[in-house]
């Protein structure tokens, strides 16, 4: 069954863009006019989970690639990774839990909480060129993003 998908670019609240730096890693950095098209476009799918007034369950794929953000436990710590999937099976409305994020809108910003690991969020560092990671909203890490809609 086809599921609803929308396409977005994400920037963190410092206006850092997200780029694919090697086959399986996203990094956050400031882009200028010349290389602005390097930033990834996310395919956001509305998937199985518990929606509420402030939380919407979504999966985040990279448009044009068979890659999805997923959350797994590595060495005892919830970890964000890019996972390769079978394009014939994904996206689907009932994604495995590791692919599901609760999209939380806070004022004009949005946060992405792992459904598998509550209170762990897609995060960026203050520093430039650092990997996007799963953080527990501690210290100076950035969890607020803005979404720019991209026509399909």
């Amino acid at each position: 069954v086809p599921i609803r998908q929308l396409h977005y670019r994400l920037r963190d609240e410092q206006q850092k863009s997200l780029v694919l730096s090697d086959p399986y890693e996203l990094k956050a950095l400031h882009l200028n006019g010349q290389n602005i098209n390097q930033q990834v476009i996310f395919s956001m799918s509305f998937v199985q989970g518990e929606p509420s007034n402030d939380k919407i369950p979504v999966a985040l794929g990279l448009k044009g690639k068979n890659l999805y953000l997923s959350c797994v436990m590595k060495d005892g710590t919830p970890t964000l990774q890019l996972e390769s999937v079978d394009p014939k099976q994904y996206p689907k409305k009932k994604m495995e839990k590791r692919f599901v994020f609760n999209k939380i809108e806070v004022k004009s910003k949005v946060e992405f909480e792992s459904a598998e690991f509550p209170n762990w969020y897609i995060s960026t560092s203050q520093a430039e060129h650092k990997p996007v990671f799963l953080g527990n909203n501690s210290g100076q890490d950035i969890i607020d993003f803005t979404m720019e809609s991209v026509s399909s």
Partner: antibody, heavy 119, light 107 residues
Framework: QVQLQQWGAGLLKPSETLSLTCAVY????????WSWIRQPPGKGLEWIGE???????NYNPSLKSRVTISVDTSRNQFSLSLSSVTAADTAVYYC?????????????WGQGTLVTVSS | QSVLTQPPSVSVSPGQTASITCSGD??????AFWYQQKPGQSPVLVIY???KRPSGIPERFSGSNSGNTATLTISGTQALDEADYYC?????????FGGGTKLTVLG
């Protein structure tokens, strides 16, 4: 309050086609998936398939070659057709709603229709 | 095809805790759901998304899901909890039910 009311022929001969319809009363029709499940006498539940308001379907692979689920949004109804029935298709057939608020699972069920296949 | 395995029967004394298991390959990677069915009635959803209760379902019903096993727990079991219980999960493109467990409340 959501209600699912189902009907259809209760007695079939082998090789005939089973046809059941489920009408939905209350609540939006387009915001949900609509499913059919069956239960042979004294046995467990078996998921048959589902449809959304646009007509997109998923079927159980074991039944896919014989099953058609269709939808009539103007009447808030959906239907099940199962061809070439045998005695093994004797079961109580349920229609149900899959809701996003319960994680796309079956939160409202019809009353069930016993379908008997016998020569 | 995917398989979810449940014990055929579980017995419990009134007021005690009943645990019904559902096992399947990497079931913990997916969301698990539980239904209660009493004789002659349609199934009723009692647990969704592993551990959440629909409105109207008593607090004594709880669920968990990790590894290869989902568990439905009924604490302070009452006579009216006697029923068949089915687990369910999604298998790529279709739903799969467990074979069902008959819960008997003794006495």
């Amino acid at each position: 309050q959501v209600q699912l009311q189902q009907w259809g022929a209760g007695l079939l001969k082998p090789s005939e086609t089973l046809s059941l319809t489920c009408a939905v009363y209350g609540g939006s029709f387009s915001d949900y998936y609509w499913s059919w499940i069956r239960q042979p006498p004294g046995k467990g539940l078996e998921w048959i398939g589902e449809i959304d308001h646009s007509g997109s379907t998923n079927y159980n692979p074991s039944l896919k070659s014989r099953v058609t689920i269709s939808v009539d949004t103007s009447r808030n109804q959906f239907s099940l057709s199962l061809s070439s029935v045998t005695a093994a298709d004797t079961a109580v057939y349920y229609c149900a709603r899959a809701s996003p608020s319960s994680g796309w699972t079956l939160d409202y069920w019809g009353q069930g229709t016993l379908v008997t296949v016998s020569s | 095809q995917s398989v979810l395995t449940q014990p055929p029967s579980v017995s419990v004394s009134p007021g005690q805790t009943a645990s019904i298991t559902c096992s399947g390959d990497k079931l913990g990677d997916k969301f698990a759901f539980w239904y209660q069915q009493k004789p002659g009635q349609s199934p009723v959803l009692v647990i969704y998304l592993d551990n959440k209760r629909p409105s109207g379902i008593p607090e004594r019903f709880s669920g968990s899901n990790s590894g290869n096993t989902a568990t439905l727990t009924i604490s302070g079991t009452q006579a009216l909890d006697e029923a068949d219980y089915y687990c369910e999960a999604w298998a790529d493109t279709y739903e799969v039910f467990g074979g069902g467990t008959k819960l008997t409340v003794l006495g």
